[in-house]
Amino acid sequence: CKAMHVAQPAVVLASSRGIASFVCEYASPGKATEVRVTVLRQADSQVTEVCAATYMMGNELTFLDDSICTGTSSGNQVNLTIQGLRAMDTGLYICKVELMYPPPYYLGIGNGTQIYVIDPEPCPDSDF
């Protein structure tokens, strides 16, 4: 089981619609053909899995139908988008990359991206 470097931005601000995107880049030591990408959320020292996808190199990144994540891959970069975020979802989002095939197995864990989510102010009632 070998270690691998994973880079991701330190901070991202979600849009007013609760969408946050960031790039997760890994330093692949070889030509991996099966890669697993997982997004984890760390808040108050608790870690939970947000979403995960396994993809074959050259194919689309496919998350489960009910996932709040979407993504695309290009070489050793994965572009991740998380939707439906609210202020309470603010936290550290960690990108984990596993090179499943061919052997040897590699695991890389990023330092995390702090995603800030600000709920939009409700529109004031209008007399017009």
């Epitope: 089981c1 053909t33 099966e34 697993r36 997982t38 984890l40 870690v47 939970t48 899995e49 396994t54 074959m56 960690i94 984990k96 596993e98 499943m100 095939y101 061919p102 052997p103 197995y105 695991l107 864990i109």
Partner: nanobody, 119 residues
Framework: EVQLVESGGGLVQPGGSLRLSCAAS????????MGWYRQAPGNQRDLVAS???????YYADSVKGRFTISRDGAKSTVILQMNSLKPEDTAVYYC?????????????WGQGTQVTVSS
């Protein structure tokens, strides 16, 4: 607690066959690379065959065309079918699961099963 339990080893004549089975407990089966390793006396533990969650399969050159690895998701079992066995296949065979759970890497091993190929 995760357990990997191997079975199916034994004594077989050259040219014979054996079927090794590894039963995995816990929720490791679908998320991890499952493999078979072997270790002969005085040697290091070497990867024989592995299968990924996506179905990609690896074989060491020394067993290609003779060994077949497969997984039964319903039974959480990994099978190593060994045909045309040779005396140099004699070793202790270990089932392995490697991957990660949240932020922790995992590398589970079974207790091993002895395979002896001799006339």
């Amino acid at each position: 607690e995760v357990q990997l339990v191997e079975s199916g080893g034994g004594l077989v004549q050259p040219g014979g066959s054996l079927r090794l089975s590894c039963a995995a407990s816990g929720n490791i089966f679908t998320r991890n690379v499952m493999g078979w390793y072997r270790q002969a006396p005085g040697n290091q533990r070497d990867l024989v065959a592995s299968i990924t969650p996506g179905g990609n399969i690896y074989y060491a050159d020394s067993v290609k065309g003779r060994f077949t690895i497969s997984r039964d998701g319903a039974k959480s079992t990994v099978i190593l079918q060994m045909n045309s066995l040779k005396p140099e296949d004699t070793a202790v065979y270990y089932c392995n699961a490697r991957g990660s759970i949240l932020l922790d890497r995992v590398n589970y091993w079974g207790q091993g099963t002895q395979v002896t190929v001799s006339s």
